[in-house]
């Protein structure tokens, strides 16, 4: 699983790229995105 902490501290990523990775993970894990 990709944690929010990991993603928010992944330097050089755009905000959309973080949302993109969250959403791809959400489609697999069905974790609520709110």
């Amino acid at each position: 699983a990709v944690s929010e902490h990991q993603l928010l501290h992944d330097k050089g990523k755009s905000i959309q790229d973080l949302r993109r990775r969250f959403f791809l993970h959400h489609l697999i894990a069905e974790i609520h995105t709110a």
């Epitope: 050089g12 990523k13 755009s14 790229d17 959403f23 791809l24 993970h25 489609l27 697999i28 069905e30």
Partner: antibody, heavy 118, light 116 residues
């Protein structure tokens, strides 16, 4: 290897309904989000619908929202697209696509043609 | 709104290189995009995703002749040592989630002709 085979296309009159199917094999179907993307004759690609791995979440563009419904049967390894109130502008080849952890449409089927005409 | 712009056509000679461009709407210049290839009479094929810093990861079976780069709002797909099978339509695409709604848009596509 990943295989996606669409079926159910054909000629249908405006205002009528049609259901497309996508049979998946070569991977654990229930572990991935799936999508439908269409391509009108001689035109570009248009995203149509996306569904999460277990079917709990669905997403549509405004162009089909309220008319099209994406669903899945994980016990049958099959993805569906129920298309109601069809219009001439829905005429297209419809492709199903599978996501990966890295991207939305990593694997594609060969498509099925839907023609809406009176 | 989220828009991707591509030149309708491009051409290059067999064995040469070609650079295809996909331009994001200015307010979306940091976005990660995807590139797809569609050979004549076939379904699309995922080529790569391409980030704002030029880093990219390619799809299954994509040869290393295909590479990506970025500059500002522009995203490039470079194909080197062109082969006849590279003649295809190339589409870029981009997705985003806004208020728990997903949106995905494609560019209009570039038709690549390989001159032989």
């Amino acid at each position: 290897q990943v295989q996606l085979v669409e079926s159910g296309g054909g000629v249908v009159q405006p205002g009528r309904s049609l259901r497309l199917s996508c049979a998946a094999s070569g991977f654990t179907f229930s572990s991935y989000g799936m999508s439908w993307v269409r391509q009108a004759p001689g035109k570009g690609l248009e995203w149509v619908a996306t569904i999460s791995s277990g079917g709990s979440y669905t997403y549509y563009p405004d162009s089909v929202k309220g008319r099209f419904t994406i669903s899945r049967d994980n016990s049958k390894n099959t993805l569906y697209l129920q298309m109601n109130s069809l219009r001439a502008e829905d005429t297209a080849v419809y492709y199903c696509a599978r996501q990966t952890t890295m991207t939305y449409f990593a694997y594609w089927g060969q498509g099925t043609l839907v023609t809406v005409s009176s | 709104q989220l828009v991707l712009t591509q030149s309708p056509s491009a051409s290059a000679s067999l064995g040469a290189s070609v650079k295809l461009t996909c331009t994001l709407s200015s307010q979306h210049s940091t976005y990660t995009i995807e590139w797809y290839q569609q050979q004549p009479e076939k379904g699309p094929r995922y080529v790569m995703d391409l980030k704002q810093d030029g880093s990219h990861s390619t799809g299954d079976g994509i040869p290393d002749r295909f590479s990506g780069s970025s500059s500002g709002a522009e995203r490039y797909l470079t194909i080197s040592s062109l082969q006849s099978e590279d003649e295809a339509d190339y589409y870029c695409g981009v997705g985003d989630t806004i208020k728990e709604q997903f949106v995905y848009v494609f560019g209009g596509g570039t038709k690549l002709t390989v001159l032989g």
